[in-house]
């Protein structure tokens, strides 16, 4: 006698929506096998018997989870064989917030896998990587689970989300980040991916150490207008290790902005520069305290400023003003940084 | 300077509820994650709970859920913790920590202040 | 969530000597992890953050190593002043979880 379950394995996902066929069969010297399927929930698939074989179709819904046991027999001997049937939800519906990132801004990345099943974190990995590689330094939140609004009932898919809190993206930036999520199933791992690209930005020549938290500059007619685009802007480390700073500008399109540079080498000075054609001239409008109490040299495109007496620069914003034109930088520099430190 | 004050605790009884305060100076509260630590007479660290900078990401360790509330006033520079439903073993020192940028340890921690759940 | 085990949980030495602390981690934490003293009465002080990282201020005679899940704090040579309770810390993932806790007390 022979006793053969196709496919042979004793797990087997399906995957929501497909079918699947589980053939039973077995053959006897002695006359035709009796060949069935039992433990069988009602809505468990569909059976076709046939002599010496038994044909399981799983529909591929929710439902059709469960262990299944096929029994042959023939005379006085008998076999079975259990098949755990796995039905699975993963399709390619990853959603990822924010759209981009801003380098140099301590955010929080998050990244949801909807219409899942089975909702077992068990089952169901994220990780947020950089080229091939998990992102170092990467702290991730809670997950969050859901159950997804579905419009046809007894269909519970759930959606899970998980949150990271991103070191800085070093300089110059990646290109972008990627969310991925893996989903382990008896013999069978599928990933879906979702890119996070990260904003561009331009750096002064010497730039800092890739690890460590840097200066952030917003170009901008207004600083309330730049806020309000929805960047959350917020300081950066006021412990060290503290890089060579070297601010960050976005890149983007419209007038011609003024470039904010530090120079940590001549004490801490700012250099605000125009580089938009002649009869442009810069100038400094905002710094933290009394503008008053700096020292500043303004020769046409060129304004430097700087602390008096020499010492440690001042925590706060800073800004630069163009014209004509009237666009402007804004710079954040965080606190307790002193000059020649680093990493 | 950094630092941080906590303030609130006391004496309470078995399912009753208090408020601690940490009052925040020396640096730019609105920016920075801040944490709630506690520690029971005798024992080790146990984080409680977290709040992002804005107040829009929230978290809370197990045995607090749906007790505890944290919350922050950046405009007071101040850091909240609503305690309901006290139980005998949330007796601790609790102290309030904030968290670096970046790096996501505990760089500066208040003094703490004691709370103590008895009939 | 990651459990953190600290050994020994309490070791006796004398000023002058090496003293060395291990932390191990449950799963992989990569390098986040922070090493904090914490003498009676007063509040946690962090010594070192990102597994080897010096916290500014802190004397170079604390020294923290490791990456993973095995992390170790060195104490070159102790001091009257290091007499204290020292926790590790993992803040890969939330919950974040510390030690138990070492308490280095004088020989």
């Known amino acids: 006698q022979s006793f053969q379950v196709n496919p042979p394995e004793s797990e087997v996902a399906v995957a929501m929506g497909t079918s699947l066929q589980i053939t039973c069969s077995m053959s006897c010297d002695e006359g035709v096998a009796r060949v069935h399927w039992r433990g069988l929930d009602t809505s468990l698939g569909s059976v076709q018997t046939l002599p010496g074989s038994s044909i399981l179709s799983v529909r591929g819904m929710l439902s059709d989870t469960g262990t299944p046991v096929c029994v042959g027999s023939c005379g006085s001997r008998s076999f079975q064989h259990s098949v755990k049937i796995l039905v699975y939800a993963f399709p390619d519906q990853l959603v990822v917030s924010p759209e981009f990132l801003v380098p140099g801004q301590d955010q929080v990345v998050s990244c949801t896998a909807h219409n899942i099943w089975p909702a077992d974190p068990n089952s169901l990995s994220f990780a947020l990587l950089l080229g091939e590689q998990r992102l170092e330094g990467a702290q991730a939140l809670e997950p969050e689970q859901e159950e997804e609004i579905q419009e046809a009932e007894g269909t519970p898919l759930f959606r899970m989300t998980q949150r990271w809190r991103l070191p800085s993206l070093g300089t110059p930036a990646p290109p972008a980040l990627h969310c991925q999520v893996t989903m382990q199933l008896p013999k069978l791992v599928l990933t879906h991916r979702k890119e996070i690209p990260v904003l561009q930005s331009q750096t002064s020549p010497k730039p800092p150490n890739t690890t460590s938290a840097e200066p952030y500059i917003l170009t901008s007619s207004s600083t309330a207008e730049a806020v309000s685009t929805g960047l959350n802007i917020t300081t950066l480390p006021s412990a060290p290790p503290y890089p060579k700073l070297s601010p960050r500008t976005l890149s983007s399109e419209g007038p011609c902005r003024p470039k904010i540079h530090q120079d940590l080498e001549a004490g801490w000075e700012l250099l605000c520069e125009a580089s938009c054609g002649p009869g442009v001239t810069v100038r400094w409008t905002l710094a933290p305290g009394d503008l008053a109490t700096y020292h500043k040299r303004e020769a046409g495109a060129q304004a430097w400023l700087s602390v008096l007496p020499p010492g440690p620069m001042v925590e706060g914003w800073f800004q630069c003003r163009q014209d004509p034109g009237g666009e402007v930088t804004n710079l954040y520099v965080p606190g307790q940084v002193t000059p020649n430190s680093s990493s | 300077e950094v630092q941080l004050l906590e303030s609130g605790g006391g004496l309470v009884q078995p399912g009753g509820s208090l408020r601690l305060s940490c009052a925040a100076s020396?640096?730019?509260?609105?920016?920075?994650?801040m944490h709630w630590v506690r520690q029971a007479p005798g024992k080790g660290l146990e984080w409680v709970s977290y709040?992002?900078?804005?107040?829009?990401?929230?978290n809370y360790a197990d045995s607090v859920k749906g007790r505890f509330t944290i919350s922050r006033d950046n405009s007071k520079n101040t850091l909240y913790l609503q305690m309901n439903s006290l139980r005998a073993e949330d007796t601790a020192v609790y102290y309030c920590?904030?968290?670096?940028?970046?790096?996501?340890?505990?760089?500066?921690w208040g003094k703490g202040t004691t709370v103590t759940v008895s009939s | 969530d990651i459990q953190m085990t600290q050994s020994p949980s309490s070791l006796s030495a004398s000023v002058g000597d090496r003293v060395t602390i291990t932390c191990r981690a449950s799963q992989s934490i990569s390098s986040s992890l922070a090493w904090y003293q914490q003498k009676p009465g007063k509040a946690p002080k962090l010594l070192i953050y990102a597994a080897s990282s010096l916290q500014s201020g802190v004397p170079s005679r604390f020294s923290g190593s490791g990456s993973g899940t095995d992390f170790t704090l060195t104490i070159s040579s102790l001091q009257p002043e290091d007499f204290a309770t020292y926790y590790c810390?993992?803040?890969?993932?939330?919950?974040?979880?510390f030690g138990q806790g070492t308490k280095v007390e004088i020989k």
């Open positions: 920590a904030r968290d670096r940028p970046y790096y996501y340890d505990m760089d500066v």
């Open positions: 020396g640096f730019t509260f609105s920016s920075y994650w």
């Open positions: 810390q993992q803040y890969k993932s939330y919950p974040v979880t």
């Open positions: 709040i992002s900078g804005s107040g829009g990401y929230t």
